[in-house]
């Protein structure tokens, strides 16, 4: 074994090419330099080693950079970033978006794994924020990136990214993680004109408090039903059928389909049934006139 | 009401590993991060890491990557920390809290609402 | 990371004081503040937040002001059961970050 670890005579590596696919593991480690593999890692993705011969080359790479590899490093790893542990990950500075998406490209089609988001997690904070062009990059190789994060990651997320975001971006997205992006959204988008503003809103709505909901009721935006489902029920309840209907506009008549399913089950439950009947749709399970409805939740702001 | 409920003390030996539970009861368990604190014997709180069980996303203080890993089991509204390599700089009070927040204006406000009761960890031979 | 600081790590006042906690934080964090307090049991409980917002069943004796770097709790008028320690904590950005603690005696 000890022999072995001597480079054979004319079997220096004097450059990075495909000579070295037919080096054993221990010729590698003998033969190549770490240096001359580092200034040449852009040539190690055209060539088809094996793992072992990727493990070899890593071990070397690892060797020469205990502290972590320099960007002009990272930037070339290609295949061999299946390689890397998210420890290893954890000591690289990545301020580059160009190295972002070359190593998230080498994982394209797969699952998010622990090193891309490890990886993520460093060039976002090297950053200091997640601006418009990383959430752009990350959202096109994941499109439920923002919502595989957490409602404090959410939080950081400065306003003027929130252009980036697509709808299907959201589809993901539980009512908590709308609840914190919908306050950017709505001063991201707070000078566009009415019907404009409402499209780029549109998909932020299921984080919508109930006095926004009014007003758009004002605004003949005619909402959807899928729109109207995702509501936060606890913003939908106090609105009146008036208002329903004016922010649902001809799709009020998707009522009906919905009667039972939340918040429009809700909602019906705290409407008076003679108001719901001006609507024509049959709903039933309005409050019967004549009865008098009290709201406990006032009474409980009030004492 | 909200609750949460954590395992009992640990007698444990350097090297070994301890796995901490923190049972969540009284509210919507996915839609709250559960948020994890250490705390020395006699000493400050330090913020170790967040476990959010809607989107199954994980954050960790970067002084304890290396240290504590969290998981959750939905079915029973728990989320775990557990705690490998144990030293004597491990021996602390570790507290579970919820973290509320809610919208206020453009921004988003944070708090720790609700704590367990801590679970102390001994580290000793 | 946000460092946190609580110079006085002990404060001796007597019933019925006004006593007053600080905080300074490293940089900016916009009012990102929160109080929290530890009772002897070591039972922890949320006080204030965001610097000034009294949170359900604090009494109003407690409040919070400051703003940038400086941020202070106030007790009005001191009772027995208010003998704890006192952390302040800022959540501006990841990792959150505690102050070392206030304790609080009776004189």
């Known amino acids: 074994e000890v022999e072995k670890t001597a480079c054979p005579s004319g079997k220096k590596a004097r450059e990075i090419d495909e000579s070295l696919i037919f080096y054993k593991k221990w010729e590698l480690e003998a033969c190549v330099d770490a240096a001359l593999l580092a200034t040449q890692m852009d040539r190690v993705n055209a060539i088809p080693f094996t793992y072992e011969q990727l493990d070899v080359l890593k071990h070397k790479l690892d060797e020469l950079y205990p502290q972590g590899y320099p960007e002009s490093v990272i930037q070339h790893l290609g295949y061999l970033f299946l390689k890397m542990s998210p420890e290893d990950i954890r000591k690289w500075n990545v301020t580059s978006l160009e190295t972002l998406k070359a190593l998230l490209e080498v994982n394209k089609g797969h699952e998010m794994s622990p090193q891309v988001a490890t990886l993520i997690d460093r060039f976002v904070k090297g950053r200091g924020q997640l601006d418009k062009d990383t959430l752009d990059t990350l959202t096109a190789f994941y499109p439920g990136y923002l919502c595989s994060l957490s409602p404090e990651e959410l939080s950081s997320v400065p306003p003027s990214s929130i252009w980036a975001v697509r709808p299907q971006d959201l589809d993901t997205c539980d009512p908590r993680q709308l609840d914190v992006l919908y306050p950017k959204a709505r001063l991201a988008f707070q000078n566009m004109n009415g019907s404009e503003y409402f499209v780029k809103i549109q998909s932020f709505l299921g984080g919508a408090p109930t006095e926004d909901l009014k007003a758009l009721s004002q605004q003949n935006v005619s909402m959807d039903l899928a729109t109207f489902m995702k509501l936060r029920t606890d913003a939908v309840l106090p609105l009146t059928v008036a208002e329903v209907q004016k922010l649902l506009g001809p799709h009020v008549e998707g009522l009906k389909a919905e009667e039972r399913h939340r918040p429009v089950r809700d909602w019906i439950l705290r409407q008076r049934q003679d108001d719901l009947d001006t609507l024509g749709l049959g709903l039933q399970g309005g409050i019967p006139n004549g009865y008098l409805v009290l709201d406990l939740s006032m009474q409980e702001a009030l004492s | 009401q909200v609750q949460l409920q954590q395992s009992g003390a640990e007698l444990v030996k350097p090297g070994a590993s301890v796995k901490l539970s923190c049972k969540a009861s009284g509210y919507t368990f996915t839609l709250y991060s559960i948020h994890w604190i250490k705390q020395r014997s006699g000493q400050g709180l330090e913020w170790i890491g967040l476990f959010y069980p809607g989107s199954g996303s994980i954050k960790y203080n970067e002084k304890f990557n290396d240290k504590a890993t969290l998981t959750a089991d939905k079915s029973s509204s728990t989320v775990y920390m557990e705690l490998s390599s144990l030293t004597s700089e491990d021996s602390a009070v570790y507290f579970c809290?919820?973290?509320?927040?809610?919208?206020?204006?453009?921004?988003?406000?944070?708090?720790?609402?609700?704590w367990g009761a801590g679970t102390t960890v001994t580290v000793s031979s | 990371d946000i460092q946190m600081t609580q110079t006085t790590s002990s404060l001796s006042a007597s019933l019925g004081d006004r006593v007053t906690i600080s905080c300074r934080a490293s940089q900016d964090i916009s009012n990102y503040l929160n109080w929290y307090q530890q009772k002897p049991d070591g039972t922890v409980k949320l006080l204030i937040y965001?610097?000034?917002r009294l949170h359900s069943g604090v009494p109003s004796r407690f409040s919070g002001s400051g703003s940038g770097t400086d941020y202070s709790l106030t007790i009005s008028n001191l009772e027995p059961e208010d003998i704890a320690t006192y952390y302040c904590?800022?959540?501006?950005?990841?990792?959150?970050?505690f102050g070392s603690g206030t304790k609080l005696e009776i004189r």
């Open positions: 965001y610097t000034s």
């Open positions: 904590q800022q959540y501006s950005q990841l990792p959150y970050t």
């Open positions: 809290a919820r973290h509320e927040g809610h919208s206020y204006g453009h921004t988003y406000l944070w708090f720790f609402d609700v």
